[in-house]
Structures are given as C-alpha cells and as structure tokens.
Amino acid sequence: SERCDDWGLDTMRQIQVFEDEPARIKCPLFEHFLKFNYSTAHSAGLTLIWYWTRQDRDLEEPINFRLPENRISKEKDVLWFRPTLLNDTGNYTCMLRNTTYCSKVAFPLEVVQKDSCFNSPMKLPVHKLYIEYGIQRITCPNVDGYFPSSVKPTITWYMGCYKIQNFNNVIPEGMNLSFLIAFISNNGNYTCVVTYPENGRTFHLTRTLTVKVVGSPKNAVPPVIHSPNDHVVYEKEPGEELLIPCTVYFSFLMDSRNEVWWTIDGKKPDDIPIDVTINESISHSRTEDETRTQILSIKKVTSEDLKRSYVCHARSAKGEVAKAATVKQKVPAPRYTVELACGFGATGSGSGSHHHHHH
C-alpha cells in the first residue's frame, strides 16, 4: 500500500464511554490534525474509512457496519454506537484517503461499566463553583448531537446516589442544575441522566461531573504575608543556623500564578556569596485558598550575614507584597553585669536579652 501520513495513537483523547449507552465519536483528524474540515475533504473526493484493533490484539480489522439495528454506523465524520458493548473497547483508526492522498490517526476507546450509584473508572471533569456567590449553573455535558431539537428528552439529576428533588439550594432546570448559593456541602459528584426515544427504542446518556466549591473572587485579596512580621526578631550569634520562614496566604483565583520569593540585599539568594537553601511547602484549604511557606536557611550565619536585608516577596493576580525580616546579631551580656552580680552576692546566672518572640 502507498504511503500514508500516520499521526500515530492520539493518547491525549482517551475516550471513555459507558456500556449500553449511545456514543458518537468524531474522527480527530479534522479536530486536531488537519487544517480542513470533513465537508471540504468530502467535496474534494476524499473518503473516510474506519477500522479498529480489539483490546489485547494486534490485528487491525474493519468495523462491522452490518450489525442488527445498525448498532455501529458512520455518519459524515462521526462513528456511532447505538449502544456500546463492553467488547467495543480498543484502538479505533479513521483514515482519510483518495488515490493521491492519505492521512490517518488512531485513538483509544474504552467502554466502562458503572454501578447503580454511577460509580465507575470514568475520569470526571471538574466544575468549580464560587462559594456564596449567587446563582451558578452547571450544564449536562457532551449531549449535543445525540438527538434532534424536535426531541424533548427527560433529564434527571442526581447528587451521588440520590435524585435531586426538594434540595434547599440546588434546583434541576432541564439540562441545567442551578445552585442558588454554593456551600462546601455542595462538593461532590453530580450526574445527569438524559433519556430520549429514537426509532422506537429508548436510550440513556449518563454524564457525571465533580463540583468543587472554591473561594469567591469577591472575597479575593492580595497575598497576605503572615511571616516574617514585626513581632518576631531573628537574633543569632555567628555560627548559629538562621531559619526564616516566609508564610503567605493566597486567596483562590482562577488561573493565578502564585509566587513567593526571597531577596537578600535586593538580589537573588544565589547571587550572594553565602550558602543559602530554600525549602518550599504548599497547603490548600477546603476552598482551594493556598498557603505557601518558603523557609530560608543559612547553616552557619556570619556577622556579615546578620547585617543583610532579608525580604520575602509574594505575588498573585491580585497584587504584590513584600516584608522584611528583622535580623540582628545577638549581643553578649557585658562583662560588668557579671561583676556587679558577683559584687552583690547574686547566686543566679546572668540572663541574656529578652525578646518578644525568640527564634
């Protein structure tokens, strides 16, 4: 056979569909690989051919389009299953060709089973709702093209295993599910079951998504530096280890790049001739607000290091802040205080200087 532009196995489109439900799968060539659409290709005399490789087999075989009730069919650039069976799992290839041109791509299709509570190995899309933000909606996804607009399907919504009816703040509205006001308690998996008739048969489409309630933009603030702060003095003797944590709170902001960094005398720590290490840790609240901590560490600090300026900087889409740490060299108790103490017949040992918080 003549050469064919082979786009290989398109693993980015790990298509998962439920067993015993309709599935319509568009040939990825026109969506992601070629610069023209199916109509243009068809007008130019190109033919779209489908074949597949069963799971755990190497043999490519044609797709049987002569099954009872047209269980598998092709329409333009779409491969239809009405409905799927478990053993439809495999790698599917669509090839566009004529006598002078050929291009093909394969993609994996996995038919998965679900239990009565809609639990399955299906990867679930995540929809973020803002906490206490007013009315927000989610829409039953990936149901376009399954039935004509003249058909009026029935849609039933579930949270987890439970049908949504008489919920306080969640109202089914056909293809939409409205949250009058979202709370943390609304976190969870939501399923819509779309039931529609076709040629005397009844089909069901099951779509599950995860709702995650996150911080609201109306409550979002610029980064807040909790440490260093004005109440803590980092007082060290030369030779001791200096540890300064920079702890920053970031409000949840969609697609914000949250940054924390230290400067020493206005420069990057690595540009200063001292052995500095920085360890970062990140934690998230239930609403995905973020706390980042960067601990600046100098194993054996010198008197020169104790004169430097250590500034923690933080930045998000909401703004930028900076805070200097108060670093001092510990002053040894003067000799005369010891002599005075002896002179007055004191029995206790002399104490060092006191600080608000000592690190």
């Epitope: 697609d255 940054e259 690595d270 290490t277 920085i278 970062e280 840790s281 990140i282 930028e320």
Partner: antibody, heavy 119, light 107 residues
C-alpha cells in the same frame, strides 16, 4: 558556574512522543522555577511551560496544553518535558531556562535541543 | 494573553551609535518586562530584568526604562559584539509572551 544541558531531541513522526531532559548544575535547583521555551527555525521565541521550584505548580501555553507535561526531579537536578501527539508545528529548538521569580526574568538558558517532527 | 509588540523589526547601525528599541504591551504589565539578546545558533541571554535592572555581568552600555505598557532598551554606544537579535518578554502573567524580535545589523 550555572549550567543547563538539554537532551532528548531528535526526529519523530507526527503523532509520536519525545521526552526532553535538562540537567542543571551550579545552583540550588530546587529553589528555582524552571521554564521550557522553544524557537521554530527562523522564528522568534515562544514560551512553552513552567514549573515551580517544588514542582507543586505547573503552567502551559495553550498550544501544548493536554499534549505536553512538565515535571522535575529535584533529587537528580533534572527538568523534563514529556511531549505527546507531536505535530509538524512543534518543530523547534527547545531551551530550558531558570527563573528565581517572574520579577527577575529567565536568567540562565541551556544551549537547546532540536526537535524535528516530520514523516 | 498579553501581546508584545517590538519596533523596529530590524535596524542598521554603526559601531558607536546609540540604539533604541521599543516594546509595547497590550495591557499594563507594571515593570515585569525583560530584555534578551540572542546571537545566531546561540541561546538567548538576559540583559535587563524588571524593566530597568541590569543583569549581573552585562555591560553598563545597556539600559532599560519604562513601566505600564511602554518600554525601551537603549544601547548607548554600539559595540561589534552587540550585533544580534533582541527580544522583550513580559513576565507579568502566564502565558509568558515575547516580542517578535529586533535584528540589529551592521550598516
């Protein structure tokens, strides 16, 4: 002396995969965010992806989202770019670069590795 | 995404000339603007960060200015080794974006 050394480039067919590596030395690797930037033959610079020092946050250009994955192994001082579903337009020299923070820019770059996507 | 527009796209100059390259951002980027120099077959090199701060080891004939949307890179007295392509880049938000480049050629 800061050094960044990319490897893993080469010729790959459309739809294929490649994994680029960037070996870092001369600085405290885990302190720094790292980026991949590419340059198609005769064209300008295009940022591809970035990862924070801890590896906890990743960022991608829309043109590679869902196809490329950036990661790092701080114990090996190595940055990676896993490239799947490669297209002809991904043909470029790929550079890794280090960044203390966005304020300081991409202050050191590797010499680049060429990725050619062609059938 | 923030678009970065450089001008001119190329210029011819002589050794000793004062050269100015401008860069405009499609929205305010504060001072998150960096300048890079790239020579054929080589990796880019950071010259200026934060709009006006000179990167360590870069000659003082290079300077940067501007904030918000309009920025300038100036080479006070062009040297033979300065003939190269110069790129501006915003690091205000991801995706990081570069200008299309300005090629400085020998007159």
């Amino acid at each position: 002396e800061v050094q960044l050394l990319e490897s893993g480039g080469g010729l790959v067919q459309p739809g294929g995969s490649l994994r680029l590596s960037c070996a870092a030395s001369g600085f405290t690797f885990s302190n720094y965010a790292m980026s991949w930037v590419r340059q198609a033959p005769g064209k300008g610079l295009e940022w591809v992806s970035a990862i924070s020092g801890s590896g906890g946050s990743t960022y991608y250009a829309d043109s590679v989202k869902g196809r490329f994955t950036i990661s790092r192994d701080n114990s090996k001082n190595t940055l990676y770019l896993q490239m799947n579903s490669l297209r002809a337009e991904d043909t470029a020299v790929y550079y890794c670069a280090k960044e203390w923070s966005s304020y300081f820019g991409l202050d050191y770059w590797g010499q680049g590795t060429l990725v050619t996507v062609s059938s | 995404d923030i678009q970065m527009t450089q001008s001119p796209s190329s210029l011819s100059a002589s050794v000793g000339d004062r050269v100015t390259i401008t860069c405009r951002a499609s929205q305010s980027i504060s001072s998150y603007l960096n300048w890079y120099q790239q020579k054929p077959g080589k990796a880019p090199k950071l010259l200026i960060y934060a709009a006006s701060s000179l990167q360590s080891g870069v000659p003082s004939r290079f300077s940067g200015s501007g904030s918000g949307t309009d920025f300038t890179l100036t080479i006070s007295s062009l040297q033979p080794e300065d003939f190269a392509t110069y790129y501006c880049q915003q690091s205000y938000s991801t995706p990081l974006t570069f200008g299309q480049g300005t090629k400085v050629e020998i007159k």
